[in-house]
């Protein structure tokens, strides 16, 4: 005979769960499906990851996302985690938003990003709900910088990048400062592959760095080089 009253709580069917903190009156729920749609858009040394919520929320509203990163070396094909070397716009675990920016990616490296959706009962199953996206970083190579000539008050500097990448560069930014003076620096922009830095102090070391500017933003910066102007005794014009 049917019971005159309904049960105060019901066992969950297979594949459905109640989280420990769920009240007995709450319906049984299940883990979410994977994020529905994931894109990875590369911008220089950054990638913007965007995704849409799972089509099946599992009947819960407490969905959070975790992002993990793997990098692969193209020459060897070997791969490894890259959490230690990249920077996320916000902590990559327990995300409630559906986008994140990953920066400090290395040129010519292949990256695979995994976005996992979880809810309050995901910890009760061993399976994971995730989607992956891969991206190759094709940021311009750092310019190779040379000292072409110097005088007591100037330094002539040139640089090069591989010819296939030159068409992507619209300008080069040359930053320089006196060694030991980290409070002020000068910036010159040029479309060419060389510049003469004038009005410098004699017998003084300057720190010089060149960076390519591309449509996607800044390319990789060169090394910080140390170049020294001539002392008044050994002046000669633009000698190296």
């Amino acid at each position: 005979l049917p019971s005159p009253e309904g049960a105060t709580s019901c066992e969950c069917e297979e594949g459905f769960f109640r989280a420990p903190q769920d009240p007995a009156s709450m319906p049984c729920t299940r883990p979410p499906s994977a994020p529905h749609y994931l894109t990875a858009v590369g911008m220089g040394a950054k990638v913007e990851l965007r995704w849409t919520p799972p089509q099946d929320s599992g009947g819960r509203e407490d969905i959070v996302y975790s992002v993990t990163c793997e990098q692969c070396w193209p020459e060897s094909g070997e791969c490894g985690p890259c959490e230690a070397s990249v920077r996320y716009s916000e902590p990559p675990h327990g995300l409630t938003r559906t986008s994140v920016t990953v920066s400090d990616l290395e040129p010519h490296m292949n990256y695979t990003f995994t976005v996992e959706a979880r809810n309050g009962v995901s910890g009760l199953v061993t399976s994971r709900s995730f989607r992956t996206a891969s991206v190759s970083i094709n940021q311009t190579e750092p310019p190779k910088v040379r000292l072409e000539g110097r005088s007591t008050t100037s330094l002539s500097v040139s640089w090069s990048i591989p010819p296939p990448q030159q068409s992507r560069v619209w300008k080069y930014e040359v930053t320089y400062r006196k060694k030991g003076d980290s409070n002020s620096y000068n910036v010159r922009r040029t479309e060419g592959f060389s510049v003469t830095l004038d009005d410098l102090a004699p017998d003084t070391t300057y720190l010089v760095q060149v960076q390519a500017l591309t449509q996607e933003g800044q390319g990789a910066g060169s090394k910080v080089h140390e170049f020294q102007t001539l002392s008044p005794e050994g002046s000669g014009n633009l000698a190296v």
Partner: antibody, heavy 130, light 108 residues
Framework: QVQLQQWGAGLLKPSETLSLTCAVY????????WSWIRQPPGKGLEWIGE??????????NYNPSLKSRVTISVDASKNQFSLKLTSVTAADTAVYYC?????????????????????WGQGTMVTVAS | SYVLTQPPSVSVAPGQTARITCGGN??????VHWYQQKPGQAPVLVVY???DRPSGIPEQFSGSNSGNTATLTISRVEAGDEADYYC???????????FGGGTKLTVL
């Protein structure tokens, strides 16, 4: 081929002054910044400071954490440079190395601060204990 | 002050490739040098200027550097490569020399 030979007292009491000397054999003494580096037992390398002797002037640069206690000096006539560390404590117990950079500091206007060290002294174990 | 971060230990089987990382803010703009140190001995320079090898250092040692990570790669690892490895840079902001904390390479 440049060689470095170092010597100095190996056992000190707290508050005493550590004193080590490094002799440079071969190479151009005034072209390089000469460094001292130390390594406490079971720990990593720590740069102490460097000196360059050009003309009659010594150019010094010290690790900020040791600066108040360190002096690195030069005897250019003997191609030697020395380390003095005052008011030592047990925390200064370490192997001390002198080292030569790979390249002259500046060549034709191109300079190499903090260059790689291609030649090291044999190391001197200095123990500070009461 | 500038900080270089190395993993305390890396383990690898003989014949495999070991990668030792050295992390630092915008380290790609600096020249990174690597040393090998065996117990009771002074350090030995194995790679300078990110990827150049001094004479006498075998080709199995190579290096790379970009972004915030420099890497020392030791291919075809053998028992004799077991040692501590240190990275080093010059911090041009403070004009001081900095070493990483060191990585102990264990050959299994």
């Amino acid at each position: 081929q440049v060689q470095l030979q170092q010597w100095g007292a190996g056992l000190l009491k707290p508050s005493e002054t550590l004193s080590l000397t490094c002799a440079v054999y071969g190479g151009s003494f005034s072209d390089y910044y000469w460094s001292w580096i130390r390594q406490p037992p079971g720990k990593g390398l720590e740069w102490i400071g460097e000196v360059n002797h050009r003309g009659s002037i010594n150019y010094n640069n010290y690790n900020p954490s040791l600066k108040s206690r360190v002096t690195i000096s030069v005897d250019a006539s003997k191609n030697q440079f020395s380390l003095k560390l005052t008011s030592v404590t047990a925390a200064d117990t370490a192997v001390y190395y002198c080292a030569k950079p790979l390249r002259p500091h500046c060549t034709n206007g191109v300079c190499y601060s903090g260059d790689a060290f291609d030649i090291w002294g044999q190391g001197t174990m200095v123990t500070v204990a009461s | 002050s500038y900080v270089l971060t190395q993993p305390p230990s890396v383990s690898v089987a003989p014949g495999q490739t070991a990668r030792i990382t050295c992390g630092g803010n915008n380290i790609g703009s600096k020249n990174v040098h690597w040393y090998q140190q065996k117990p009771g001995q002074a350090p030995v320079l194995v790679v300078y200027d990110d990827s150049d090898r001094p004479s006498g250092i075998p080709e199995q040692f190579s290096g790379s550097n970009s972004g915030n990570t420099a890497t020392l790669t030791i291919s075809r690892v053998e028992a004799g490569d077991e040692a501590d490895y240190y990275c080093q840079v010059w911090d041009s902001s403070s004009d001081h020399l900095v070493f990483g904390g060191g990585t102990k390479l264990t050959v299994l």
